[in-house]
Interface confidence: low
């Protein structure tokens, strides 16, 4: 008899058993893939290759050679069929054969599926080399890839230990800041109390030199009174003794004309026999109006009435037309005398005009014009100069013909633009002109290249600004 | 360092027209005056035109009026002076100069004119 099963073993491999008459044949084989064509992407005797660097391909990989061992099965389940079949055949060929041919039978087969198996199994051992090595490869990379990510985390570690270092620093300069801050603060309102004293105090002072200042003037005034009335009781004096010393003094009268008590200028004032530079007070001609006056009583002559001095920036010259009529300042340091009173007093006789100069570098200079006067407010107080001498250049720095007097509020220059604001003070701009006495007071070595400074362009060019001025005007015949 | 550059200068025939361009450089031309100056051959310098700083207010010799244009471009720092219908007698160097006070005067005389250019010949004949 004869009869073919099929069973697994302990190891979980097929087995074939084929039971003829007393004889039994087991056939033992592996689950394995059918013979690969030549076109198959890893031949089963290839060269195993170098493993991928792209862990995605390995896994790509594993798959072909898991559809491999897939198709491996089939075919051998294929195999298995077949063997069933011609098996059967055989079997009814060997009972009609003769017994002695059947053991060749056998064999043969035996053989032929031993020479198979054999080679399948070369082939899984291959697949299997293949995927043992693919497998240390991956395990490989991934040892790669972690110990990359353990130096990552180290280093991020670290980069957080910095940043826990800085945030600390940080805080700690913040507080530093705060604290800096708040002894600022403490300071600056220490300051700002001390200033607020300060202030106080400025305002006392001020106060007192105001009241000083009056006194000052008021003492002068009073001593050029005293010199007045003592240059009197001397005459009357001297004309008493004439008097008694002469033989027909009982017949004679004593007849004294009335002493002069107000003056139209210092010229007057000199005259009068009163030669001490100071303030004096003058009287607006044909009016009882009364004006302080600086009156210099040294200069080529004395006699001259100031009417513009600049000496140190005390005093703002950025005014109003009003105050430029009407004068302003300080008679005993800058002032500006008033353009009313010299208008009327110049319009009346024949005056001369001195302008005074004087630079950073310790030189003096000045313009001397031999007529001078200021029209009246209806004509903006129009200034008029001839007959230029002096030192301080050939051509005159007041623009000739004379030009209208203009201020910040009052603009009569020839200029489209506003000459006294641009330039600052009150002057007699043309467009703008060549000089500005009344400009901005700038300090040594802040008085170059300023165009809005104290300028008298013919001596010092046009970006100089003067360290001191004086305008003083006197009758012409004096 | 402050400079003054003219050029545009060259021969032209009588009736013609030149454009004169002053180019300053190392300060801002803005606060001032600039002046354009000729001096012919055996003669004194004279004032040709000047014009101011911000307000652009300009002068013109009475010989040029109406002939000449003077024309600043603060954003390029320069000056020009336009002449039209030259005669014979614009024949000159022609310098530009710059007033540092802002202002122009009457007659355009630059006895104090701050800075001062090379110059640029301008010929007017046939």
């Known amino acids: 008899y004869s009869n073919f099963r099929k069973s697994v073993d302990s190891t979980g491999r097929r087995q074939y058993q084929v039971q003829n008459g007393p004889c039994s044949y087991t056939f033992l084989l592996p689950e394995t893939d059918s013979c690969r064509s030549s076109s198959s992407p890893y031949m089963s005797n290839a060269v195993q290759r170098d493993a991928p660097l792209d862990y995605d391909d390995s896994v790509q990989r594993l798959q072909v050679l898991e559809n491999i061992l897939e198709n491996n099965t089939q075919w051998l389940m294929k195999l298995e069929n077949y063997i069933q079949d011609n098996m059967k055949k055989e079997m009814v060929e060997i009972q009609q054969n003769v017994v002695q041919n059947q053991t060749a039978v056998m064999i043969e087969i035996g053989t032929s599926l031993l020479n198979q198996t054999a080679a399948q199994t070369r082939k899984l051992t291959d697949v299997e080399a293949q995927v043992l090595n693919q497998t240390t490869r991956l395990e490989l990379q991934l040892l790669q890839h972690s110990i990359s990510t353990n130096k990552l985390e180290k280093q991020i570690l670290d980069q957080t230990s910095e940043i826990n270092k800085l945030q600390n620093k940080n805080s700690f300069l913040e507080q530093k800041v705060l604290d800096m801050e708040g002894k600022h603060s403490e300071q600056l309102q220490s300051m700002k109390e001390q200033k607020d004293e300060l202030q106080v105090l400025v305002s006392k002072q001020s106060s007192v030199i105001d009241e000083l200042e009056k006194k000052l003037v008021t003492a002068t005034v009073n001593n050029s009174l005293l010199q007045k009335q003592q240059h009197d009781l001397m005459e009357t004096v001297n004309s008493l003794l004439t008097m008694m010393s002469s033989p027909n003094s009982k017949s004679s009268v004593a007849i004294r004309k009335e002493e002069q008590t107000t003056f139209r200028d210092c010229a007057e004032i000199f005259k009068s026999g009163l030669t001490t530079s100071g303030i004096y007070t003058l009287t607006f001609p044909n009016s009882t109006e009364e004006i302080k006056a600086y009156c210099d009583m040294d200069v080529g002559g004395g006699g001259w009435t100031v009417i513009q001095h600049r000496e140190d920036g005390s005093v703002d010259f950025q005014r109003t037309w009003k105050e430029y009529k009407e004068g302003f300042g300080s008679p005993l340091g800058e002032y500006w005398l008033g353009n009313e009173f010299v208008s009327q007093l110049t319009g009346q006789h024949r005056y001369v005009l001195k302008i005074q100069l004087k630079d950073w570098e310790g030189n003096e200079a000045h313009s001397l014009y031999d007529h001078f006067y200021l029209a009246g407010e209806e004509s903006n107080y129009r200034i008029h100069l001839t007959g230029l001498t002096g030192t301080a250049g050939k051509i005159s720095s007041i623009s000739q013909p004379g030009s209208d007097f203009s201020t910040k509020d009052s603009d009569n220059d020839k200029c489209i633009c506003k000459c006294s604001q641009m330039l600052s003070g009150g002057w007699w701009f043309d467009a703008c002109g060549p000089s500005n006495l009344n400009g901005q007071y700038y300090p040594q070595k802040q008085n170059t290249n300023k165009f809005n400074g104290i300028k008298w362009y013919y001596w010092k060019g046009s970006g100089y600004s003067l360290k001191a001025t004086t305008m003083m005007i006197r009758p012409a015949d004096f | 360092d402050v400079q003054l550059v003219e050029s545009g200068g060259g021969l032209v025939q009588p009736g013609g027209s030149l454009r004169l361009s002053c180019a300053a450089s190392?300060?801002?031309?803005?606060?001032?005056?600039i002046g354009w100056f000729r001096q012919a051959p055996g003669k004194e310098r004279e004032g040709v035109s000047c014009?101011?700083?911000?307000?652009?207010?300009?002068y013109y010799a009475d010989s040029v009026k109406g002939r000449f244009t003077i024309s600043r471009d603060n954003s390029k720092n320069t000056v020009y002076l336009q002449m039209n219908s030259l005669r014979p007698e614009d024949t000159a160097v022609y310098y530009c100069?710059?007033?540092?006070?802002?202002?122009?005067?009457?007659?355009?005389?630059?006895?104090?004119?701050?800075?001062w250019g090379q110059g640029t010949l301008v010929t007017v004949s046939s």
């Open positions: 190392g300060f801002a031309l803005d606060y001032y005056a």
């Open positions: 014009i101011s700083s911000s307000d652009g207010i300009t």
């Open positions: 100069a710059t007033d540092s006070g802002g202002y122009i005067d009457y007659d355009c005389m630059g006895l104090g004119y701050d800075y």
